[in-house]
Interface confidence: low
């Protein structure tokens, strides 16, 4: 599923991401834009053999199990395939764990490079939330 900007903002808000661990909703929508272009089925292979999955490109080295990543920790205790669902519940719950793990949203390279320090509220402007 490819979400619309406001559609994703509403879904993320419904799942409790607005101001979760201090990060406003715009940060999450911005991260999803530059990680996956709002596509829940996005996958990208990394040079270390791990893969990033889903709308927030969650990595199989640490957070989920795809059965092919050596030394995977699977800290979210989920199959990586769950992160590709059109239902973003699994991605959101795992993201909550990631953002709470000490580095905040710096865990997402795209957020660091494209969203951090910018007017992220622009990503939810005009949305009925």
């Amino acid at each position: 599923k490819v979400f619309g900007r406001c559609e994703l903002a509403a879904a993320m808000k419904r799942h409790g991401l607005d101001n979760y661990r201090g990060y406003s909703l715009g940060n999450w929508v911005c991260a999803a834009k530059f990680e996956s272009n709002f596509n829940t089925q996005a996958t990208n292979r990394n040079t270390d053999g791990s893969t990033d999955y889903g709308i927030l490109q969650i990595n199989s080295r640490w957070w989920c199990n795809d059965g092919r990543t050596p030394g995977s920790r699977n800290l979210c205790n989920i199959p990586c395939s769950a992160l590709l669902s059109s239902d973003i519940t699994a991605s959101v719950n795992c993201a909550k764990k990631i953002v709470s793990d000490g580095n905040g949203m710096n865990a997402w390279v795209a957020w660091r490079n494209r969203c951090k320090g910018t007017d992220v509220q622009a990503w939810i402007r005009g949305c009925r939330l």
């Epitope: 409790g16 979760y20 920790r73 800290l75 979210c76 205790n77 989920i78 769950a82 519940t89 699994a90 719950n93 795992c94 909550k96 764990k97 990631i98 709470s100 793990d101 000490g102």
Partner: nanobody
């Protein structure tokens, strides 16, 4: 402010059952890994069980597997521990706790005040 309030402890005969409850406030338990830890008289803390925030996984210490069941009711913001086939060695103060994020074997960062379970005939 995070608060955890346990209830449901008491005296029960061997082979009996109890259900412990933990009412949480100051946060949503659906966002957290939540667990139960116990301390038997004169002994150290023993991890009993926890439930992952994503709802996929529950974990149990070997000593309680098959007898205890952890669950939660997100609408009531309450965690439960159903304890069946209780044994004398289950006698302890049981603490509800919020698990630290990120690491499966990490510790707990918030605790309740505990509820005493005594298994005796």
């Amino acid at each position: 402010e995070v608060q955890l309030l346990e209830s449901g402890g008491g005296l029960v005969q061997p082979g009996g059952s109890l259900r412990l409850s933990c009412a949480a406030s100051g946060f949503r338990i659906s966002d957290e890994d939540m667990g139960w830890v116990r301390q038997a008289p004169g002994k150290g803390l023993e991890w009993v069980s926890y439930i992952d925030n994503n709802g996929y996984s529950t974990y149990y210490a070997d000593s309680v597997k098959g007898r205890f069941t952890i669950s939660r009711d997100n609408s009531k913001n309450t965690l439960y521990l159903q304890m069946n086939s209780l044994r004398a060695e289950d006698t302890a103060v049981y603490y509800c706790a919020k698990k630290q994020y990120g690491y499966q074997n990490g510790g707990f960062d918030y605790w309740g005040q505990g509820t005493l379970v005594t298994v005796s005939s």
